[in-house]
Amino acid sequence: ATKVVCVLKGDGPVQGIINFEQKESNGPVKVWGSIKGLTEGLHGFHVHEFGDNTAGCTSAGPHFNPLSRKHGGPKDEERHVGDLGNVTADKDGVADVSIEDSVISLSGDHCIIGRTLVVHEKADDLGKGGNEESTKTGNAGSRLACGVIGIAQ
């Protein structure tokens, strides 16, 4: 199995650790971990194109989209590879993350290693917002925290 980790940090109180594991090269990726310091509710959760945090989370670029698709939800066929939907923070501002995704990979053309994981200010509307921004970002707003996805020990 391939194991990968991402430490999320931002300018504010949001921080977290997210783990990824893929047992087979064409199998699903398990994503789990915890993010704290969020406001209660839904927050967009995406893999972005670049593993570049030199200017903070903005330098991570747009959602990882090697198939020239529009934004969607993780269960949609019409989605960016990096579209992992939302995480949900409780009243204490903690989001316990547990996702299984069959589109991202830890190898091959959809490999997310070396790219940036971002948690956003607002809920991702999963491409259903009815405006142009929805088809690009899901109207998820600013980038609260991010980290480069790297190979774990």
Epitope: F50, G61, P62, N65, L67, S68, R69, E77, E132, K136
Partner: antibody
Framework: EVQLVESGGGLVQPGGSLRLSCAAS????????MSWVRQAPGKGLEWVAN????????DYVDSVKGRFTISRDNAKNSLYLQMNSLRAEDTAVYYC?????????WGQGTLVTVSS | VIWMTQSPSLLSASTGDRVTISCRMS??????LAWYQQKPGKAPEVLIY???TLQSGVPSRFSGSGSGTDFTLTISCLQSEDFATYYC?????????FGQGTKLEIK
């Protein structure tokens, strides 16, 4: 290997119609947005239309809205462009391309000439 | 509509040269920019998307950079097969638009 092969171009009079086809192979056609992009002789590239993988959404550049219709048949791995009320300014090589927002790979193109 | 200005429209260079092609937008497009190469009588080929991501199979001598309104395609060491016309394209805002092209010719 991805292959896109356009056909259906030719000479047509102003006001006439043509239907372009694009046969796709080498990839899962039903999983991709597809687009038509045109290039007038000696000119640059102009995006014309695109269609969602399941055919449920289409977008058009303003200059062809109401005259051109993009469609697809996923069972036949085929993309189409029905062009009605053709004008001289529609004269171009028409390319089909994979993708809905940026484009590639592309077919070799088919020439449409609108002239009396 | 987002208007795009590519410069120069014609660029003369020699093999081994490093060349840059500029693409300027009428408004910011974040990182939603692609670059294409077209050889005479052939279809365009995508080189780069998302400003700087090389499409599979594209040689590493091609690179892209920029953000907001100003973007650059760089070819670090020109090869004979690189003499062609290059187009930028924005996919930030509908309708998707292309630059007018830069013809790269042998000096």
């Amino acid at each position: 290997e991805v292959q896109l092969v356009e056909s259906g171009g030719g000479l047509v009079q102003p006001g006439g119609s043509l239907r372009l086809s694009c046969a796709a192979s080498g990839f899962t056609f039903s999983s991709f947005w597809m687009s038509w992009v045109r290039q007038a002789p000696g000119k640059g590239l102009e995006w014309v239309a695109n269609i969602k993988h399941d055919g449920s959404e289409q977008d058009y550049v303003d200059s062809v809205k109401g005259r051109f219709t993009i469609s697809r048949d996923n069972a036949k791995n085929s993309l189409y462009l029905q062009m009605n009320s053709l004008r001289a300014e529609d004269t171009a090589v028409y390319y089909c391309a994979r993708g809905g927002i940026w484009f590639g790979p592309w077919g070799q193109g088919t020439l449409v000439t609108v002239s009396s | 509509v987002i208007w795009m200005t590519q410069s120069p429209s014609l660029l003369s260079a020699s093999t081994g040269d490093r060349v840059t092609i500029s693409c300027r937008m009428s408004q910011g497009i974040s990182s939603y920019l692609a670059w294409y190469q077209q050889k005479p009588g052939k279809a365009p080929e995508v080189l780069i998307y998302a400003v700087s991501t090389l499409q599979s199979g594209v040689p590493s001598r091609f690179s892209g950079s920029g953000s907001g309104t100003d973007f650059t395609l760089t070819i670090s060491c020109l090869q004979s097969e690189d003499f062609a016309t290059y187009y930028c394209q924005q996919y930030y805002s509908f309708p998707y638009t292309f630059g007018q092209g830069t013809k790269l010719e042998i000096k």
